[in-house]
């Protein structure tokens, strides 16, 4: 089949990095500067991606492969193949259309990207807050309030259990 196809279509013999030039009797011509063909038998070469401004070059374009971009420091990649660059924020912030804004009380973000998330509610797991949360860090949950009661042992009766859903202030 390949042999038949090549007899019918001389362009199928053109390797990656070339194109089948109709203006030159379907001869295989090298891709012009700033263009590439990643597969054989192509009738045109594709324009190389330009990495400029918010983008910077991670891999240069060659005659057989497109350029690859990442983001200039201060921004991070989004989308397949780094199709977009999005601004970094500091830990304890989230990105809004107004720029980077501090996390509201009761929320945190421990990364340079993403949104502020609510602190863990320790009491839902029957635990108490061991370390308070900040804008940058989640709370650390500790043992349940009953476990922390002084004198709780096999000798003395256990402290009365707290109402569910309540944690010490």
């Amino acid at each position: 089949f390949e042999r038949t196809r090549s007899l019918q279509d001389p362009c199928s013999n053109c390797p990656a990095g070339t194109f089948c030039d109709n203006n030159r009797n379907q001869i295989c011509s090298p891709c012009p500067p700033n263009s590439f063909s990643s597969a054989g038998g192509q009738r045109t070469c594709d324009i190389c991606r330009q990495c400029k401004g918010v983008f910077r070059t991670r891999k240069e374009c060659s005659s057989t492969s497109n350029a690859e971009c990442d983001c200039t420091p201060g921004f991070h990649c989004l989308g397949a193949g780094c199709s977009m660059c999005e601004q970094d924020c500091k830990q304890g912030q989230e990105l809004t259309k107004k720029g980077c804004k501090d996390c509201c009380f009761g929320t945190f973000n421990d990364q340079k990207r993403g949104i502020c998330r609510p602190w863990t509610n320790c009491s839902l797991d029957g635990k108490s807050v061991l370390v308070n949360g900040t804008k940058e860090r989640d709370v650390v949950c500790g043992p349940s309030p009953a476990d922390l009661s002084p004198g709780a042992s096999s000798v003395t009766p256990p402290a009365p259990a707290r109402e569910p859903g309540h944690s010490p202030q």
Epitope: G53, V54, F75, L78, G79, M84, C85, E86, T96, K97
Partner: nanobody, 123 residues
């Protein structure tokens, strides 16, 4: 071909003014949020300002509030940044950049930017 070309940069004294322009070709400017970002010598990229499709929403980084004004003329496919009361710390390469599809809804990614124009504030 989608393209953004900035112009208007130059050398200006502290306290002076400058107006940057950005010409958009290959797409309909009025469909997109637009941004200015800058890169000071030896520093990372910093977002400066953005403006929504019809110009009714404009936001700025704190350091330029009250001094810079972003605007657009969709009929002329142009974006502008009017800079006044310029300071040495405003020295940077300024880039205009397009907000990608879905900007402001589920991301704040920029998908196209220009080569930049250099602003130097010095006496």
């Amino acid at each position: 071909q989608v393209q953004l070309v900035e112009s208007g940069g130059g050398l200006v004294q502290p306290g002076g003014s400058l107006r940057l322009s950005c010409a958009a070709t290959g797409f309909t400017l009025s469909n997109y949020w637009m941004n200015w970002v800058r890169q000071a010598p030896g520093k990372g990229l910093e977002w400066v300002a953005n403006i929504n499709q019809d110009g009714s929403e404009r936001y700025y980084v704190d350091s330029v509030k009250g001094r810079f004004t972003i605007s657009r003329d969709n009929a002329k496919s142009s974006l502008y940044l009017q800079m006044s009361s310029l300071r040495a710390e405003d020295t940077a390469v300024y880039f205009c950049a397009r907000g990608g599809e879905g900007y402001g809804v589920d991301h704040y990614g920029l998908d196209v930017s220009g080569q930049g124009t250099t602003v130097t504030v010095s006496s």
